[in-house]
């Protein structure tokens, strides 16, 4: 196993419909044809994987169905997006990127990206 | 709250084996940085082995090198120390530890850490 550079913005602020939205970039050594991403998060002392996807290189990343992620892949870059997000899914989200196929597999783990999730006040009752 | 639960120590003769495990309870170890530690009576504790986040890299003190192996099974939610080739001066408790480190250093393993288990006795003794 290997190890290689990915890169990730530091912050991001969801917006108010719970969207976030941020670039994963990895530093590929080799033409890789396999790529699997994963999104993990860092909160309170524990990480839980957010969503994963494998992608052949050209082709569209596709996550599960029922998957709070969505991404679309150019080169060496990966342009995710995750739903769904409330005040208390804040944390650091991690991009985990890993080579899988041909050999040799590499493994590269961004330093996180801090989302902001605020939720948006309710409106207030109108009088008619 | 995530707690370290220690377990596999034992008499055993010199020359034996043993594998200690190192169980989370309350949570899991995924990434974390975990280490092993021992303490023999009237001596200071010193680190044995580590092993990263990641599980890429793994450290052993010179008087283990080759006897002692660290290895974990995110599945299992438990790391291991394997100890081959055990001699009188093994004789210890053993602690498990863990930290959960910044993602910039879940290859590497931790300076300090902040969860501490309860130990398991090794005594190697003919």
């Known amino acids: 196993c290997k190890a290689m550079h990915v890169a990730q913005p530091a912050v991001v602020l969801a917006s108010s419909r719970g969207i976030a939205s941020f670039v994963c970039e990895y530093a590929s050594p080799g033409k890789a044809t396999e790529v699997r991403v994963t999104v993990l998060r860092q909160a309170d002392s524990q990480v839980t994987e957010v969503c994963a996807a494998t992608y052949m290189m050209g082709n569209e990343l596709t996550f599960l169905d029922d998957s709070i992620c969505t991404g679309t892949s150019s080169g060496n870059q990966v342009n995710l997006t995750i739903q769904g997000l409330r005040a208390m899914d804040t944390g650091l989200y991690i991009c985990k990127v890993e080579l899988m196929y041909p050999p040799p597999y590499y493994l590269g783990i961004g330093n996180g990206t801090q989302i902001y999730v605020i939720d948006p006040e309710p409106c207030p009752d109108s009088d008619f | 709250e995530v707690q370290l639960v220690e377990s596999g120590g034992g008499l055993v003769q010199p020359g034996g084996s043993l594998r200690l495990s190192c169980e989370a309870s309350?949570?899991?170890?995924?990434?974390?940085?975990i280490g092993w530690f021992r303490q023999a009576p009237g001596k200071e504790r010193e680190e044995v082995s580590c092993?990263?986040?990641?599980?890429?890299?793994?450290n052993y003190a010179d008087s283990v090198k080759g006897r002692f192996t660290i290895s974990r099974d995110n599945s299992k939610n438990t790391v291991y120390l394997q100890m081959n080739s055990l001699r009188a001066e093994d004789t210890a408790v053993y602690y498990c530890?863990?930290?959960?480190?910044?993602?910039?250093?879940?290859?590497?393993?931790?300076?300090?850490?902040?969860?501490w288990g309860q130990g398991t006795q090794v005594t190697v003794s003919s």
């Open positions: 092993i990263s986040g990641t599980g890429l890299r793994t």
């Open positions: 309350g949570g899991t170890l995924d990434y974390w940085s």
């Open positions: 530890t863990g930290k959960l480190l910044h993602p910039s250093l879940w290859s590497a393993c931790a300076n300090e850490y902040d969860l």
